[in-house]
């Protein structure tokens, strides 16, 4: 570590005095101190002498000696006071710039340590400091305003009490800059705009920042628009607003609008699209198939997307039949707005009953007219089966009727013994009926088919079973011949309740 002679931390001299500061180190050494006149520097290998033969108050300051080659970077310092009765202050800088919440050092150095007890910091023209100004003083360095605020950007003077009167330093201008976290915050409203040719429109682009130094512009496609800027300051933010007012829109006004704001931190931009149309429009669509099939007892949500301008004047869901004149309960109809011009309407149909199959229509109206979108809802049912014994054209025939949706397939089984249902071990014969006769097939109803099995002789210790199945489930009916006559047996599980 270098050594300074004289080996005292502070040296007090009078104006005009000769001052010699010598620094010695292992290698070459360098002096660093306040920029002041009259110093001469003499270096000789490992020592360096700083001297003046006419010290002035401007030489007041801390002089530091460093050894550039020292890996530990050690240094030694001495503080020189040149106590001038007429000049209690040596101001090293007349402008200090800091960011908010940093400590601001106002470098007015006291030229006489004895005066320390009577120092104070004031604003120019004797005005007191602003409330909540937290500051401290060091005779070596000056006044420090702690955690400086933007509002403390003022002109200050350092005051010392000399012989009962206050003597001021020259003024120091403090500039406290706002910490700009990034580019200005932006809003562009609306996010999307549709207008009919000839209508009025308004697009508002606004930007705000803690600092007033930022630019904002509104751009259409690639053209920067000339819009008078409105400026404001509230909530501690500067706001600049550009309002594009169009009295009568035309097709050339359509396109992409970008709100762009920039400051030293960079640029932000946000965009919206403006559509100009010839006339009102109303479009209905659904992501679902308009023909829906649902198993009875289950639920279904019907969804319609609406794109419209101007807004809807009316809308509703209607049941068009064919079963009853019931209408969907309003509480089951739900509307959500995706954005200004797009909406989704949902009709919830929980635990569907047979009477709720049919056509459901969503109707909407705006100045462009009426539009409707109709869903066809068919319910799926598992088959219901019944078997009877009859004679057709003199032949004994088992007649199986199966009813369900989708159309059931029919299979006959003959098995040994009397049973409610044939199992594999008992099966003697299986007949598939690929083309059962369709007895009824109306929209939204079950399909009823009939299958005939001609039996020349009924075997009494056997069971004849008609099985029907579709994509929903299956049903069966066992027919057991008895000597006294035929006996039919529906299986227990057929007791079906939708």
């Amino acid at each position: 570590i270098p050594v300074i002679e004289p080996s005292v931390p502070e040296l007090v001299v009078k104006p005009g005095a000769t001052v010699t500061l010598r620094c010695v180190g292992n290698g070459s050494v360098e002096w660093d101190g306040p920029p002041s006149p009259h110093w001469t520097l003499y270096s000789d290998g490992s020592s360096s002498i700083l001297s003046t033969n006419n010290a002035t108050f401007q030489n007041t300051g801390t002089y530091r000696c460093t050894e550039p080659g020292d890996p530990l970077g050690g240094s030694a310092a001495i503080h020189l006071y040149v106590k001038d009765p007429a000049r209690p202050w040596n101001v090293l800088a007349q402008e200090v710039v800091v960011f908010e919440d940093q400590d601001a050092l106002l470098p007015c150095l006291l030229t006489d340590p004895v005066l320390e007890a009577g120092v104070s910091l004031v604003r120019v023209r004797g005005r007191p400091l602003m409330r909540h100004t937290n500051y401290s003083f060091s005779p070596w360095h000056g006044f420090t305003i702690h955690r400086a605020k933007f509002i403390q950007s003022q002109d200050y003077q350092c005051s010392a009490l000399m012989g009962g009167r206050k003597v001021m330093s020259i003024s120091i201008r403090l500039k406290v800059q706002k910490v700009i976290p990034g580019p200005p915050a932006l809003t562009l409203v609306p996010a999307e705009l549709v207008r009919i040719r000839g209508e009025a429109a308004q697009i508002v682009c606004s930007a705000s920042s803690v600092d007033v130094n930022f630019d904002v512009f509104l751009q259409h496609n690639n053209t920067k628009l000339a819009i008078p800027q409105q400026s404001d300051f509230h909530n501690n933010r500067y706001q600049k607003v550009l309002t594009l007012n169009l009295d009568q829109v035309d097709f050339q006004h359509a396109g992409n609008y970008s709100c762009v704001a920039s400051n030293v931190q960079g640029k932000h931009s946000t965009s919206m699209f403006f559509r100009v149309v010839e006339s009102a429009y109303l479009n209905l669509s659904s992501e679902q198939n308009l023909i829906q099939e649902v198993t009875v007892g289950e639920g279904l949500n019907l969804k319609v997307m609406v794109e419209a301008y101007p807004g809807l004047q009316g809308f509703n869901w209607t049941y068009l039949g064919p079963f009853s004149d019931h209408q969907p309960e309003p509480k089951l109809a739900n509307a959500t707005t995706k954005d200004t011009y797009r909406h989704t309407f949902t009709l919830s149909l929980p635990r569907l009953k047979p009477s709720e199959a049919g056509r459901y229509s969503f109707l909407a109206r705006n100045p462009g007219g009426w539009r409707a979108l109709t869903f066809e809802l068919t319910l799926r049912y598992p088959p219901e089966v019944s078997v009877i014994w009859t004679f057709i054209n003199g032949s004994g025939t088992l007649l199986c009727a199966a009813s369900g949706y989708p159309q059931p397939n029919v299979t006959w089984l003959q098995c040994s013994g009397h049973t409610d249902r044939c199992d594999e071990a008992q099966v003697l014969q299986v007949w598939d009926d690929p083309y059962p006769e369709v007895l009824s097939q109306e929209p939204f109803h079950k399909v009823t088919v009939q299958s005939l099995l001609t039996v020349e002789t009924l075997e009494h210790n056997q069971t004849y079973e008609c099985r029907a199945h579709n994509s929903v489930g299956s049903g069966s009916w066992a027919f057991i011949p008895i000597s006294a006559g035929a006996h039919t047996h529906p299986p227990d599980e057929f007791l079906f309740t939708p």
Partner: antibody
Framework: QVQLVQSGAEVKKPGASVKVSCKAS????????MHWVRQAPGQGLEWMGR????????YYAQKFQGRVTMTRDTSISTAYVELSRLRSDDTAVYYC???????????WGQGTLVTVSS | DIVMTQTPLSLPVTPGEPASISCRSS????????????LDWYLQKPGQSPQLLIY???YRASGVPDRFSGSGSGTDFTLKISRVEAEDVGVYYC?????????FGQGTKLEIK
Amino acid sequence: QVQLVQSGAEVKKPGASVKVSCKASGYTFTGYYMHWVRQAPGQGLEWMGRINPNSGGTYYAQKFQGRVTMTRDTSISTAYVELSRLRSDDTAVYYCARKNPWGHFDYWGQGTLVTVSS
Amino acid sequence: DIVMTQTPLSLPVTPGEPASISCRSSQSLLDSDDGNTYLDWYLQKPGQSPQLLIYTLSYRASGVPDRFSGSGSGTDFTLKISRVEAEDVGVYYCMQRIEFPYTFGQGTKLEIK
């Protein structure tokens, strides 16, 4: 519909001042810059400057600096141009023109003839 | 200031015939940032205020017949009338607005032969 209606003709002596008004209607006055253009008899068009009706900020052509003042009163949607120290070569028709956001002058006042004569 | 020079200063035309007015600027009116050329054309009919014909080089103003067209690039510009009609008489001005002060050409007087 958009209209810019200017004040009537003026006759002034050299050295005097004149103030011409331009009342806007049919649109949002503060949403468009207002420019002033003049035309000496039998001559071409000459741009004088513009005012931001929002802030009152102005920009004047160098030729008129120090002699021209553009102001506005947003409460009555009116823009004004005042020209001082009039000379005979200031005799002209003075027009106000609304600047469309796309930059061109889409609406013009009917013009105000200012005659400077001793 | 940017100087705008129009030619011819007078243009006698027979109705139904085409007409062409030239305008030259002392520096480029092309904005390299957005690619637009900031030149407009105005028509001042006798006894009337000027009215906009063409803006930003080639865009026709609302209500302007399609017989009017603007073209050009950089410093040389042209206003064309495909078939002159009697109502087209007046003085045509080009104007630059790429920078302040805005400046106009001297005007071209179109008259019917």
